[in-house]
């Protein structure tokens, strides 16, 4: 999906109002220095591409993020403010229901969410630069 035509201001508002709080709650008990940020993004559409990938694509050591509250809110936000995004998710939703797994917060998942926080902050910064 090409995130170029999203309403970035509206996405930023949703992130600041609610998604950020859920990400921080997920990370509670860990320090910001516990993980190094290895994933970056260069512009707003690129940031959203990386955020989508890290949030919804299961990895061998962290398969359960898509069911977290911040992930559900991220999906809702993208579906709302990115034209045509919802139709790309119809089949993806069915596949996700089939592979539903037990929720386990592993260190790898914490690291992945730490990367997500970094990507979202980068998204906000690139937005501020444009303004």
């Amino acid at each position: 999906y090409d995130f170029t035509n999203c309403d970035f201001q509206k996405i930023e508002a949703d992130y600041l109002r609610t998604i950020s709080k859920d990400l921080i709650t997920y990370m509670s008990g860990t320090k910001s220095t516990d993980f190094n940020n290895t994933v970056s993004c260069s512009n707003r559409p690129h940031c959203l591409t990386e955020i989508q990938s890290l949030t919804f694509n299961p990895t061998p050591r962290c398969a359960s993020l898509a069911k977290e509250m911040f992930a559900r809110k991220t999906k809702a936000t993208l579906a709302l403010w990115c034209p045509g995004y919802s139709e790309t998710q119809i089949n993806a939703t069915q596949a996700m229901k089939k592979r539903r797994k037990r929720k386990v917060t592993t260190n790898k998942c914490l690291e992945q969410v730490s990367q997500l926080l970094g990507l979202w902050r980068r998204f906000i910064r690139t937005l501020l630069k444009k303004q």
């Epitope: 508002a13 949703d14 609610t18 139709e87 119809i90």
Partner: antibody, heavy 120, light 107 residues
Framework: EEKLQQSGDDLVRPGAAVKMSCKAS????????MHWVKQRPGQGLEWIGT????????DYNQNFKGRATLTADKSSNTAYMELSRLTSEDSAVYYC?????????????WGQGASVTVSS | DIVLTQSPATLSVTPGESVSLSCRAS??????VHWFQQKSNESPRLLIK???QSISGIPSRFSGSGSGTDFTLNINRVESEDFSVYYC?????????FGTGTKLELK
């Protein structure tokens, strides 16, 4: 079974405001946005706006911005629409309709409609 | 805003005939079009989602096709209960919009 129960019909004066409700049952309230649609007698469907309980956010058709206010009470699974500064043009049937925000993405259940008559 | 134009405005048919209703978008909207039926004094009812996907409980005589800007609702062998108004709707981008409607009436 998913159900949307709307409040009753209303007769209101021009310039006044009306607040209607839409009580949801049979599904997880926060998994869906609540949309509001206007239909004047013998006319088509006009999208007013939506409230997304999961995100506590709303969006409006420009034609209704500033006059329509969409809210929801998550504890009672009820969505509300308040329409202010009413004129005769607002005499219509108003529908609420749910739409999935993390799946489905379509208005698959509708309320029975609430008729508003604006008259002095 | 995306404008949806439906044609014809009115379609007069006899039961048993097959009909096609058209919905044209003012800009490409992929497959983000849904079809609703509205009978007199009733709420709209979802018939087809995302241009061609069927809905549970809807008779198989209703089908949809199209993508981009041109969409079609087909009714195979119209039955008496099908006489009503049909609307297309786009959810490609906000604000969501409805088509102008097509009234299917008895000839």
């Amino acid at each position: 079974e998913e159900k949307l129960q709307q409040s009753g019909d209303d007769l209101v004066r021009p310039g006044a405001a009306v607040k209607m409700s839409c009580k949801a049952s049979g599904y997880i309230f926060t998994d869906y946005a609540m949309h509001w649609v206007k239909q004047r007698p013998g006319q088509g469907l006009e999208w007013i706006g939506t409230f997304i309980p999961l995100l506590d956010t709303s969006d409006y058709n420009q034609n209704f911005k500033g006059r329509a206010t969409l809210t929801a009470d998550k504890s009672s699974n009820t969505a509300y629409m308040e329409l202010s500064r009413l004129t005769s043009e607002d005499s219509a049937v108003y529908y609420c309709a749910r739409m999935g925000v993390t799946h489905s993405y379509v208005m698959d259940a509708w309320g029975q409609g609430a008729s508003v008559t604006v008259s002095s | 805003d995306i404008v949806l134009t439906q044609s014809p405005a009115t379609l007069s048919v006899t039961p048993g005939e097959s009909v096609s209703l058209s919905c044209r978008a003012s800009q490409p909207i992929s497959i983000s079009v849904h079809w609703f039926q509205q009978k007199s004094n009733e709420s709209p009812r979802l018939l087809i989602k995302f241009a061609s996907q069927s809905i549970s409980g809807i008779p198989s005589r209703f089908s949809g096709s199209g993508s981009g800007t041109d969409f079609t609702l087909n009714i195979n062998r119209v039955e008496s209960e099908d006489f009503s108004v049909y609307y297309c709707q786009q959810t490609f981008s906000l604000p969501y919009t409805f088509g102008t409607g097509t009234k299917l009436e008895l000839k």
